[in-house]
C-alpha cells in the first residue's frame, strides 16, 4: 500500500511531498558548514557542532532533541611527543624518519588541530627489529607466509598495505604471528587510480597523504571498558588489561613515499607472487631485513599515544508518531570525523541534516508519520562505533521491543558511477520499489529511474533484471542495531565502479585531504548524488514509518537462506570424507529452510487478504514482520563473539567490513583441515549445523498462525 | 611550484676537486631523491647517480665510483655533488633532476645546470 | 648496463606535420611490479631537459596532447601529432627501471 493512506495524511502529504522537499543546494551548504573545520570525537569542536545540530533541529520542527553523553574509551597522540618510524644504522642513530604530520591542502594551512596520522588505540612501544613485507596481512597473507614460505614473522615488524580487509583484522593477525609491531600503509596500486592526479588537482592520494583509523577488534562491543552496558555515569569500568579489543603491538600508518623509503631496501625471499606487488618501484621482497648493503640497519617504531576516557555526545532527535508512537524508525549516522570529514561522516550528516528539515517542514505543515522517527547524530564511531553502541546499550529494552528498522547514514559516495545498498533482505522489496520511483542522476540515464541505471551498472549475480544488494557486514553504527539486537537494517549510497577501480575504499579515506572541495570539485560538482542518497535513505524512512502494512517481504529471506545454505554446504562438501566419518548432515538446515520457505509463503498470502481497517489484526501482522529479524537472534551469541548474536549474518571473522552467512557453520568449518583434533572440530561444526537450523525453523514459526 | 637551483660556473684545473650545490623549494625535500647527470656533447646525457635525502642513502654509477660524492643538508634542502681528480673530458653542463618518485618515477624537475670547464 | 638506441638522429619536420621517434633498449624495461619505466625528454635550445612522458605513455602534467608515447618491452615510440614551431629541440628517451638510468643519444627535431 502507497504511504497516502495512512492515518490524518491530506494528499499533500505523502512521500512526493517529502521527497520533492529535498534539495542538493541545502545538502551543499551543509556539507560546508560541517567540514570547515575538524571534528575529531571528544574534542570541543564537536561538543559544539552536536549543540549546533541539536539547535537546528529543533527548528527544523523535531518534537524533541537531546543529547546523550557517554565517557569512553578514546586514543589521541601525544602533542609533544610525536609519533613516527625510524630507518636506524648498526650504532642505533635515525638515519631515516617517517614524517610527522600530512601537508595541509591548500586553504587550511593555518587549521589548527589537525590530529597528525594515527592508528587508534596503539599502545605505546618502542619496538626495533627487521621488517616483514605481508602483503595485506590478511589470514591468507600469513597462511602463505607461514606455511608456504616458512617465513616466521615472531619478534619482527611487519609492514602491511591497506585495503581488501579492516585495519583491525590486520594487527590481530600479525599479533597472532608473532610480530612485535605493525607499519600500515598506503599503496597506490590500491589508492590510486590510474590516470587521475592527486589532491589539491584531482581525487587522487599524494604521496604524503595518510590513512588513520582504529585498530580495535571489539567484535560489537562498544566502549572497550564497558562492554554490553552504557558508558554512564554510575559505571563500571574494566582496568585497561582487561578492556575488550585492545591491540598488544605498536601500529602506525604511514604514506606511499615513506613507505617507498622503507621497501626499496627489503632483502631476502622475494614475494610469492605478484599479487603481492603494488604499485612502487620496489622489489616487494617480504624480507625478513634489509638486502645486502642495508641488512645492519633496523626499523624502529616510536609510538607515545594515550588512551583516555573522554565524554562523547549523540544528538538523538524525535518526530512522534501518530498511530504507533511505540513503533521506532531510526535514520543515524555519525558526526565525528578523523580531520576535516569531507566524505566521511559529513557527506552522510549532511543528507541527514537535509531529510530532518524535509521532515520537519511536513510536520509545521500540520503532518505526522504514523511510526516514531527517530534521527541520531553519533558519536565516536571512528573510534570503534562507540557512540551508537552505548546508545543502543543504554536503550536495548525499548529497541528490541519497539525497533522496526535501522538505516544507516554514513558517507554518502564513495564514488559517482552508481548505486550501492547493502541491507536485510526484509528490505530488498522496498528498495526496489522505491528506486523504481526514483530518478536517476546518472549521465545517459535521463528520464530513466533510478532502479534503471542501478541494475544496468551493478546487476545481480543471481538473477537477472535485478540489481546487486549486499550482505550487511559491520565497520559502522548499524552493527549494534542489526548484529546485536536483530533490528532490520539497510545502508545506501553512490560508490565507484568496482570493475574498473580496483582501488579499497575512495583514495583519501581518513586522510586530511577529505575536505569539502574534494567533494565539490570533483565527486558530485552539482550535489545530484547526494540528492539522490537522501531520496533513497528519506525515502526509505518515509516507508518504514508510514506505510499501514510494514515494507517487508519475507518470502527474500527464504530465497536467500536456501542460498546461504546451498553455500556452506558446498564448502563443507570439500571434505567429503570427514563428513562421512563424522556423520556430518545438513539435512536438518535444509529442512529447516524448506519449512520457512512454506511458512514464509503463506505468510505473504494471509499478508494480502487479511482486513487493514482491524487495527489488532493489523498490529499482530506488522509485529510478525517486526520480530521476524529479532527471531535470528540467538541469546548466546556466536562462539567468542557475544555480541554479535545474529545467526544468519555476522562480520566475518576475517575481515569486520564484510558480511558472513551462516557465520557459526562458516567459522567452525574454516581451516577445518589444519586442526589438530579433527573430532573436536568437526564436533563443532555439527554443533553449529544444529544451532543454525533450529534458529531458521524457529523464525519460520514466529510467521505462522499464531492459534 | 617545485624549484631547483643551482650553483654558478665553475672553472678548475685537471685532478682538482668540484663541489656542486642544488637548493630545493616549492616540496618537502625529503621525500624526493635528487639525481645528478651531466651533459657532453660526446657523451649526450649521463646519470650519474643520486641521493636520498631522508636518509642520505647514495646510489653511484659505476663509471663515477671513487671520483663522486653525493651529500646533503636537510636544514636547507639543499643537494650537492663533488666530482675529484677532474679531467678534461668532464667538461660538462651538470643538472640535479629531482626523481618524481611514484606515479613518474623520471626526472620531473631539473636545475637550470651548471657549467664545469676543466682546462689547464 | 642498458644501451637506449635512438633513431633518427635528426628529424626535419615541416609546420603541422606529425613526426615519429623510436627508441630500442637492450633489454626489456618491465620492472617486476609489471611498469616500464621508459621516459622521454625535450630539451629546448639553451634549456634544461623537460620530461615529457613517463611510463611509456603518461603525459607529465603541462605537455600538450598532441604528444603521445606507445610501446612495450623493448620498442618505443614518441609521436608528436602536428608539430609546432616551439617543438624544436632534442629529445632524449631514457630509462629508470635499471641502475644505472641511461639516455639515449638524442633526436633533434627542426622545422624545414
Known amino acids: 500500500k502507497s504511504s497516502n493512506e495512512a492515518t490524518n495524511i491530506t494528499p499533500k502529504h505523502n512521500m512526493k511531498a517529502f521527497l520533492d522537499e529535498l534539495k542538493a543546494e541545502n545538502i551543499k551548504k551543509f556539507l560546508y558548514n560541517f567540514t570547515q573545520i575538524p571534528h575529531l570525537a571528544g574534542t570541543e569542536q564537536n561538543f559544539q557542532l552536536a549543540k549546533q545540530i541539536q539547535s537546528q533541529w529543533k527548528e527544523f520542527g523535531l518534537d524533541s532533541v537531546e543529547l546523550a553523553h557517554y565517557d569512553v574509551l578514546l586514543s589521541y597522540p601525544n602533542k609533544t611527543h610525536p609519533n613516527y618510524i625510524s630507518i636506524i644504522n648498526e650504532d642505533g642513530n635515525e638515519i631515516f624518519n617517517t614524517s610527522l604530520f600530512e601537508p595541509p591542502p591548500p586553504g587550511y594551512e593555518n587549521v589548527s588541530d589537525i590530529v597528525p596520522p594515527f592508528s587508534a588505540f596503539s599502545p605505546q612501544g618502542m619496538p626495533e627489529g627487521d621488517l616483514v613485507y605481508v602483503n595485506y596481512a590478511r589470514t591468507e597473507d600469513f597462511f602463505k607466509l607461514e606455511r608456504d614460505m616458512k617465513i616466521n614473522c615472531s619478534g619482527k615488524i611487519v609492514i602491511a598495505r591497506y585495503g581488501k580487509v579492516f585495519r583491525g583484522n590486520k594487527v590481530k593477525n600479525a599479533q597472532l604471528a608473532g610480530a612485535k609491531g605493525v607499519i600500515l600503509y598506503s599503496d597506490p596500486a590500491d589508492y590510486f587510480a590510474p590516470g587521475v592526479k592527486s589532491y589539491p588537482d584531482g581525487w587522487n592520494l599524494p604521496g604524503g597523504g595518510v590513512q588513520r583509523g582504529n585498530i580495535l577488534n571489539l567484535n560489537g562491543a562498544g566502549d572497550p571498558l564497558t562492554p554490553g552496558y552504557p558508558a554512564n555515569e554510575y559505571a563500571y569500568r574494566r582496568g585497561i588489561a582487561e578492556a575488550v579489543g585492545l591491540p598488544s603491538i605498536p601500529v602506525h600508518p604511514i604514506g606511499y613515499y615513506d613507505a617507498q623509503k622503507l621497501l626499496e631496501k627489503m632483502g631476502g625471499s622475494a614475494p610469492p607472487d605478484s599479487s603481492w606487488r603494488g604499485s612502487l618501484k620496489v622489489p616487494y621482497n617480504v624480507g625478513p631485513g634489509f638486502t645486502g648493503n642495508f641488512s645492519t640497519q633496523k626499523v624502529k617504531m616510536h609510538i607515545h599515544s594515550t588512551n583516555e576516557v573522554t565524554r562523547i555526545y549523540n544528538v538523538i532527535g524525535t518526530l512522534r508518531g501518530a498511530v504507533e508512537p511505540d513503533r521506532y524508525v531510526i535514520l543515524g549516522g555519525h558526526r565525528d570525523s578523523w580531520v576535516f570529514g569531507g566524505i566521511d561522516p559529513q557527506s552522510g550528516a549532511a543528507v541527514v541534516h537535509e531529510i530532518v528539515r524535509s521532515f520537519g517542514t511536513l510536520k509545521k505543515e500540520g503532518w505526522r508519520p504514523r511510526r516514531t522517527i527517530l534521527f541520531a547524530s553519533w558519536d565516536a564511531e571512528e573510534f570503534g562505533l562507540l557512540g551508537s553502541t552505548e546508545w543502543a546499550e543504554e536503550n536495548s529494552r525499548l529497541l528490541q521491543e519497539r525497533g522496526v528498522a535501522y538505516i544507516n547514514a554514513d558517507s554518502s559516495i564513495e564514488g559517482n558511477y552508481t548505486l550501492r545498498v547493502d541491507c536485510t533482505p526484509l528490505m530488498y522489496s522496498l528498495v526496489h520499489n522505491l528506486t523504481k520511483e526514483l530518478k536517476s542522476p546518472d549521465e545517459g540515464f535521463e528520464g530513466k529511474s533510478l532502479y534503471e541505471s542501478w541494475t544496468k551498472k551493478s546487476p545481480s549475480p543471481e538473477f537477472s533484471g535485478m540489481p546487486r544488494i549486499s550482505k550487511l557486514g559491520s565497520g559502522n553504527d548499524f552493527e549494534v542495531f542489526f548484529q546485536r539486537l536483530g533490528i532490520a537494517s539497510g545502508r545506501a549510497r553512490y560508490t565507484k565502479n568496482w570493475e574498473t577501480n580496483k582501488f579499497s575504499g575512495y583514495p583519501l579515506y581518513h586522510s586530511v585531504y577529505e575536505t569539502y572541495e574534494l567533494v565539490e570539485k570533483f565527486y558530485d560538482p552539482m550535489f545530484k548524488y547526494h540528492l539522490t542518497v537522501a531520496q533513497v535513505r528519506g525515502g526509505m524512512v518515509f516507508e518504514l514509518a508510514n506505510s499501514i502494512v510494514l515494507p517487508f517481504d519475507c518470502r527474500d529471506y527464504a530465497v536467500v537462506l536456501r542460498k546461504y545454505a546451498d553455500k556452506i554446504y558446498s564448502i563443507s562438501m570439500k571434505h567429503p570424507q570427514e563428513m562421512k566419518t563424522y556423520s556430518v548432515s545438513f539435512d536438518s538446515l535444509f529442512s529447516a529452510v524448506k519449512n520457512f520457505t512454506e511458512i514464509a509463503s503463506k505468510f505473504s498470502e494471509r499478508l494480502q487478504d487479511f482486513d487493514k481497517s482491524n487495527p489488532i489484526v493489523l498490529r499482530m501482522m506488522n509485529d510478525q514482520l517486526m520480530f521476524l529479524e529479532r527471531a535470528f537472534i540467538d541469546p548466546l551469541g556466536l562462539p567468542d563473539r557475544p555480541f554479535y548474536r545474529h545467526v544468519i549474518y555476522a562480520p566475518s571473522s576475517h575481515n569486520k567490513y564484510a558480511g558472513e552467512s551462516f557465520p557459526g557453520i562458516y567459522d567452525a568449518l574454516f581451516d577445518i583441515e589444519s586442526k589438530v583434533d579433527p573430532s573436536k572440530a568437526w564436533g563443532e561444526v555439527k554443533r553449529q549445523i544444529y544451532v543454525a537450523a533450529f534458529t531458521v525453523q524457529a523464525a519460520a514459526e514466529t510467521l505462522s498462525e499464531v492459534a | 611550484q617545485v624549484q631547483l637551483v643551482q650553483s654558478g660556473a665553475e672553472v678548475k684545473k685537471p685532478g682538482a676537486s668540484v663541489k656542486l650545490s642544488c637548493k630545493a623549494s616549492g616540496y618537502t625535500f625529503t621525500y624526493f631523491d635528487i639525481n645528478w647527470v651531466r651533459q657532453t656533447p660526446e657523451q649526450g646525457l649521463e646519470w650519474m647517480g643520486g641521493i636520498s635525502p631522508g636518509d642520505g642513502n647514495t646510489n653511484y654509477n659505476e663509471n663515477f665510483k671513487g671520483r663522486v660524492t653525493m651529500t646533503r643538508d636537510t636544514s636547507n634542502s639543499t643537494a650537492y655533488m663533488e666530482l675529484s681528480r677532474l679531467r678534461s673530458d668532464d667538461t660538462a653542463v651538470y643538472y640535479c633532476?629531482?626523481?618524481?618518485?611514484?606515479?613518474?618515477?623520471?626526472?620531473?624537475?631539473w636545475g637550470q645546470g651548471t657549467t664545469v670547464t676543466v682546462s689547464s | 648496463d642498458i644501451v637506449m638506441t635512438q633513431t633518427p638522429l635528426s628529424l626535419p619536420v615541416t609546420l603541422g606535420d606529425p613526426a615519429s621517434i623510436s627508441c630500442r633498449s637492450s633489454q626489456s624495461l618491465v620492472y617486476s611490479n609489471g611498469n616500464t619505466y621508459l621516459n622521454w625528454y625535450q630539451q629546448r635550445p639553451g634549456q634544461s631537459p623537460r620530461l615529457l612522458i613517463y611510463k611509456v605513455s603518461n603525459r607529465f602534467s603541462g605537455v600538450p596532447d598532441r604528444f603521445s608515447g606507445s610501446g612495450s618491452g623493448t620498442d618505443f615510440t614518441l609521436k608528436i601529432s602536428r608539430v609546432e614551431a616551439e617543438d624544436v629541440g632534442v629529445y632524449y628517451c631514457?630509462?629508470?627501471?635499471?641502475?644505472?638510468?641511461?639516455f639515449g643519444q638524442g633526436t633533434k627535431l627542426e622545422i624545414k
Open positions: 633532476a629531482r626523481d618524481g618518485n611514484f606515479p613518474y618515477y623520471a626526472m620531473d624537475s
Open positions: 631514457s630509462q629508470s627501471t635499471h641502475v644505472p638510468y641511461t
